[in-house]
């Protein structure tokens, strides 16, 4: 039932892509939470921000992240599709001046302070895989997405469209 | 150029069926969620359901589920909708509609079959 | 579900004229909202997603602007192609309902 991996055919095309606008065409604050419903929190430690990914007691307020959406353009060489090859990246900032940033040299993800323009490492291009669940591939390293390993956040390669649906890589966006 | 043709429309007597199909070309069918959208004559829109051709995940307007299905055959490009137990208050022009982004799904249906009637009457 | 509401259902305008459409979401749905135009016996046409982007190739007469519960379509200078009917809808978030048109037809 899976098509063409995504994640191989588009490898040069989104490396090349550009962000079409500087300025997000929309942003949504909502909390985050794993497939099988772990709430992702941030909590400042040391001056720094550490991310992790627990059961959150009842009643405990979830932390929120502001999702900025950008649209990106396909190389229409490579998109089949011409000028209509749009993909939606996203950055998220769980805080002021915070972003997640894809760390490729040791699979990890950080929180970085930074100033706009953003640097690459802190997009995202945004899958579907359900209608209810998104996952998030690094701009700067396709076919590795964000995912959870030993109750934190990863990067974590994948090779196939089959393993796009594997849980680890799947979250859930709560806007209440 | 993108290009989705709609057939399998006509004439159907009150709780019998119809299968939809949508012919999906000039684009990686793979990768775009694909939607049903109705109106009936006169009418206003109203959207049916959708469907990740490369995941099989789908999701519905909960007015349809359980006597309409949302399927997809990649090897066809094809989209398909099998409508079952079906009333006089389905009578509509059926179209497909793909949204504008790769892999994601927004609901905005930027490019739109020519749509197929389906007429319930007996 | 969240409901959209149209205002004119139907008006009469003149070539040259300044015309514009209101929609009113139920609730607060942000800026996820997108216009479309639908001419007799045709698809429609996607001219505005995301309340304010024209779509590629929409003529920049369209315009469209609001977020919350109240978004408006203003077309500057209607010319004789744009007699239609023109639709809101919310979208985004499951399921994505419609508002229920506008018609635009020659004074």
């Known amino acids: 039932a899976f098509g063409i991996s995504g994640v191989q055919k588009y490898t040069r095309a989104l490396h090349d892509s550009s962000i079409t606008g500087i300025s997000p065409i929309t942003e949504y604050l909502a909390s985050l939470s794993t497939y099988n419903d772990q709430s992702i929190t941030f909590a400042l430690e040391d001056e720094s921000y550490e991310i992790y990914v627990e059961d959150l007691k009842k009643d405990e307020k979830k932390d929120k992240v502001l999702l900025s959406y950008y649209e990106s353009q396909h190389p229409s060489n490579e998109s089949g599709d011409g000028v209509d090859g749009k993909m939606l990246m996203v950055t998220l900032s769980p805080t002021k001046d915070f972003w997640l940033h894809a760390n490729n040299k040791e699979h990890s993800v950080e929180l970085h302070k930074c100033e706009k323009p953003l640097p690459d490492q802190a997009f995202f291009v945004l899958h579907n895989m359900h209608s209810n669940c998104v996952s998030f591939e690094c701009k700067t390293d396709p076919g590795v997405f964000i995912g959870v390993k030993d109750n934190h956040l990863a990067l974590i390669k994948v090779d196939s469209s089959e393993n796009l649906c594997t849980e680890n890589i799947l979250f859930k966006l709560s806007e209440t | 150029e993108v290009q989705l043709v709609e057939s399998g429309g006509g004439l159907v007597q009150p709780g019998g069926s119809l299968r939809l199909s949508c012919a999906a070309s000039g684009f990686t069918f793979t990768d775009y969620w694909v939607s049903w959208v109705r109106q009936a004559p006169g009418k206003g829109l109203e959207w049916v359901a959708e469907?990740?051709?490369?995941?099989?995940?789908?999701n519905f307007n909960e007015n349809f589920k359980g006597r309409f299905t949302i399927s997809v055959d990649n090897a066809k490009n094809s989209l398909y909708l099998q409508m079952n137990s079906l009333r006089a208050e389905d009578t509509a022009v059926y179209y497909c509609?793909?949204?504008?982004?790769?892999?994601?799904?927004?609901?905005?249906?930027?490019?739109w079959g020519q749509g197929t009637l389906v007429t319930v009457s007996s | 579900d969240i409901q959209m509401t149209q205002s004119p259902s139907s008006l009469s305008a003149s070539v040259g004229d300044r015309v514009t459409i209101t929609c009113k979401a139920s609730?607060?749905?942000?800026?996820?909202l997108a216009w479309y135009q639908q001419k007799p016996g045709k698809a429609p046409k996607l001219l505005i997603y995301y309340a304010s982007n024209r779509y590629t190739g929409v003529p920049s007469r369209f315009s469209g602007s609001g977020s919350g519960t109240d978004f408006t379509l203003t077309i500057s200078s209607l010319q004789p192609e744009d007699f239609a009917t023109y639709y809101c809808?919310?979208?985004?978030?499951?399921?994505?309902?419609f508002g229920g048109g506008t018609k635009v037809e020659i004074k």
């Open positions: 509609a793909r949204g504008p982004y790769y892999y994601s799904t927004q609901i905005i249906f930027a490019y």
């Open positions: 809808q919310r979208i985004y978030n499951s399921p994505p309902t």
């Open positions: 469907i990740y051709p490369n995941s099989g995940a789908d």
């Open positions: 609730q607060n749905v942000g800026n996820n």
